[in-house]
């Protein structure tokens, strides 16, 4: 058993049928010695008396808010949550496996640049009685500061019969140098509590590996005289790290017909312009990627050919 | 501690091409190592990230773009002094700091070259003959060093008398390649910045 926060405790249980559970001793936070009784949640049934209460915690019916009283007055509370260990592996019931970029990916994180700011998000099908708390650091043995905001509900979607809820959090490394070569990964830890179930999820990454630039901006077409060709031009996104000659991007330009089955023409360039043939009803799209370290491509910025 | 913006004339920077080749070569070598050593801990998540140049060179700091010198988090590092003559410096206006930067890059390359050659000698003794260093990568390191053309003491190749532990050698190879790839990215960024300046 360990303390999650004041008066909230997590009991770690080896979770299998007929498991013996864990013996827990609760102590009433009071100078009083006599006439103390204990109850669980809203029930008025007295579970025991005395300054301490010993309970055998086996299942969720044994968890909840234990309260000690004296003469009708509440003295203190202890909330017990359960953390299930199933065959040596901590349970992951609360969050959905996003399966990207690999199986058992519960937290996904992205950064728009090298400033040390990043966003993480996760999915769940649970809509109520759910709280999240996020902590982060650079490294784990001698952790350096990363400040995270509060997790917020950022999207709701319908997936088949189920509703899916997306939560996200923004974090910022306290003293980040965009040019630094990372040797210690960022660690992100999310505590999730659903009713009386506690779970924790972690992710470890280097900012360089989660970079995903914003799409190029100001995408424009300039027809070339007496030709079906157009000059496409664009600019670096505002959110990208500067100077651009140091933090350079590379670009992919794509000409896509109306039908998804039509052949796509693709050009790769380090410049911020390219000459392509514009077909009728086609659209031109451009996306960006760090020129020197191949992390994710940005989303496409698009303009119609017409 | 930073690079001035107004230095060599555009197109007068022969090191850019070499640094691009270097990044390509080390990336290919790392990919090959990850595939060949699939039963060894060779991914970025599994290895310890060690920098063999730590406390010996200060490339990131010496080559910091002018625009980032206002960022205090970028300025908390060591001072290192280097020899200052090099053929990549195509202009007499080149500042002392730029020479320091390129000299630091040269020292990095020299250190990695020695490590890789020592390691290759060990890998050649492996009866499994599982992996060797790409000669192209070693050649590209050499070319960039020649383009930088700094006078520097030659570092003798480390020789070891004890029987090599091939498992440890292969893991060390992965660690070195990951670190060298990160340094090659920095070198490429620096060369690109200098070329644009």
């Amino acid at each position: 058993i360990w303390e999650l926060k004041k008066d909230v405790y997590v009991v770690e249980l080896d979770w299998y049928p007929d498991a013996p559970g864990e013996m827990v001793v609760l102590t009433c936070d009071t100078p009083e010695e006599d006439g103390i009784t204990w109850t669980l949640d809203q029930s008025s049934e007295v579970l025991g008396s005395g300054k301490t209460l010993t309970i055998q915690v086996k299942e969720f019916g044994d968890a909840g808010q234990y309260t000690c009283h004296k003469g009708g007055e509440v003295l203190s509370h202890s909330l017990l949550l359960l953390h299930k260990k199933e065959d040596g592996i901590w349970s992951t019931d609360i969050l959905k496996d996003q399966k990207e970029p690999k199986n058992k990916t519960f937290l996904r994180c992205e950064a728009k640049n090298y400033s040390g700011r990043f966003t993480c998000w996760w999915l769940t099908t649970i809509s109520t009685d759910l709280t999240f708390s996020v902590k982060s650091s650079r490294g784990s043995s001698d952790p350096q500061g990363v400040t995270c905001g509060a997790a917020t509900l950022s999207a709701e979607r319908v997936r088949g019969d189920n509703k899916e809820y997306e939560y996200s959090v923004e974090c910022q490394e306290d003293s980040a140098c965009p040019a630094a070569e990372e040797s210690l990964p960022i660690e992100v830890m999310v505590d999730a509590v659903h009713k009386l179930k506690y779970e924790n999820y972690t992710s470890s990454f280097f900012i360089r590996d989660i970079i995903k630039p914003d799409p190029p901006k100001n995408l424009q077409l300039k027809p070339l005289k007496n030709s079906r060709q157009v000059e496409v031009s664009w600019e670096y996104p505002d959110t990208w790290s500067t100077p651009h000659s140091y933090f350079s991007l590379t670009f992919c330009v794509q000409v896509q017909g109306k039908s998804k089955r039509e052949k796509k023409d693709r050009v790769f360039t380090d410049k911020t312009s390219a000459t392509v043939i514009c077909r009728k009803n086609a659209s031109i799209s451009v996306r960006a990627q760090d020129r020197y370290y191949s992390s994710s491509w940005s989303e496409w910025a698009s303009v119609p050919c017409s | 501690r930073n690079l001035p913006v107004a230095t060599p004339d555009p197109g007068m920077f022969p090191c850019l091409h070499h640094s691009q080749n270097l990044l390509r070569a080390v990336s290919n070598m790392l990919q090959k190592a990850r595939q060949t050593l699939e039963f060894y801990p060779c991914t970025s998540e599994e290895i310890d990230h060690e920098d063999i140049t730590k406390d010996k060179t200060s490339t990131v700091e010496a080559c910091l773009p002018l625009e980032l010198t206002k960022n205090e988090s970028c300025l908390n590092s060591r001072e290192t002094s280097f020899i200052t003559n090099g053929s990549c410096l195509a202009s007499r206006k080149t500042s002392f700091m730029m020479a320091l930067c390129l000299s630091s890059i040269y020292e990095d390359l020299k250190m990695y070259q020695v490590e890789f050659k020592t390691m290759n000698a060990k890998l050649l003794m492996d009866p499994k003959r599982q992996i060797f260093l790409d000669q192209n990568m070693l050649a590209v390191i050499d070319e960039l060093m020649q383009a930088l053309n700094f006078n520097s003491e030659t570092v003798p190749q480390k020789s070891s008398l004890e029987e090599p532990d091939f498992y440890k050698t292969k893991i060390k190879l992965c660690i070195l390649l990951h670190a060298f790839r990160i340094r090659a990215v920095t070198i490429d960024r620096v060369m690109s910045y200098l070329n644009a300046s």
């Epitope: 080896d14 979770w15 299998y16 498991a19 199933e86 065959d87 040596g88 690999k102 058992k104 099908t125 | -």
Partner: antibody
């Protein structure tokens, strides 16, 4: 005490269907994940499928994906394995088992796929 | 497709020490706990070892388990005639959990 009693096995022709049941008692069935494991005659153990305690997530071995469906009825304390498009290579003893560090197994039920 | 490899058979005379190896990789045994089962002919598997080296109550202390890196082993010190059975190791793969990964199985024969 924990008990898992299996039923539903038998002889079936290739291409046909069969449903296995596993009735649980002696524990809070709705709190635990459950597996199906099979063993072909003279061969080793092969995992078939898993279902979460609340039925929200199901996982299958590649060899049965798209043909077998694991389900549970927590009100009846029963686990099921619906097997469709059966093949000769599905011939095996099928076991249900609880998920956890200490597990409990059903007695096994024989499924023979033969024309 | 078995990812955990065991020797097909091992044998020993009563009282001898018999060991069975179970070889895996970084993503399974290297990252997860190992269990060992004993299966007597015509019966369901019986749990012998969980959590690499833990014995459930009722399992004789001549059975012991251990794990090192990407391999695990089961030792029977002072093997007895009633130990003649098939033995299976089991773990998980970190990418496919909760799918159970079983070893290929080892037939233990008690001679004499």
């Amino acid at each position: 005490q924990v008990q898992l009693v299996q039923s539903g096995g038998g002889v079936v022709q290739p291409g046909r269907s069969l449903r296995l049941s596993c009735a649980a008692s002696g524990f809070t069935f709705s709190s635990y994940g459950m597996h199906w494991v099979r063993q072909a005659p003279g061969k080793g153990l092969e995992w078939v499928a898993f279902i979460r305690y609340d039925g929200s997530n199901k996982y299958y071995a590649d060899s049965v994906k798209g043909r077998f469906t694991i389900s549970r009825d927590n009100s009846k304390n029963t686990l099921y394995l619906q097997m469709k498009s059966l093949r000769a290579e599905d011939t095996a003893v099928y076991y249900c088992k609880t998920h956890g560090s200490h597990d409990n197994w059903g007695q096994g039920t024989m499924v023979t796929v033969s024309s | 497709s078995y990812v955990l490899t065991q020797p097909p058979s091992v044998s020993g005379t009563p009282g001898q020490r018999v060991t069975i190896s179970c070889s895996g990789g970084r993503s399974n045994i290297g990252s997860n706990d190992v269990k060992w089962y004993q299966q007597l002919p015509g019966t369901a598997p019986k749990l012998l070892i969980y959590g690499n080296d833990q014995r459930p109550s009722g399992v004789p202390d001549r059975f012991s388990g251990s794990k090192s890196g990407t391999s695990a082993s089961l030792a029977i010190t002072g093997v007895q005639a009633e130990d003649e059975a098939d033995y299976y190791c089991q773990s998980y793969d970190r990418g496919t959990h909760p799918a159970l990964l079983f070893g290929t199985g080892t037939k233990v024969t008690v001679l004499g």
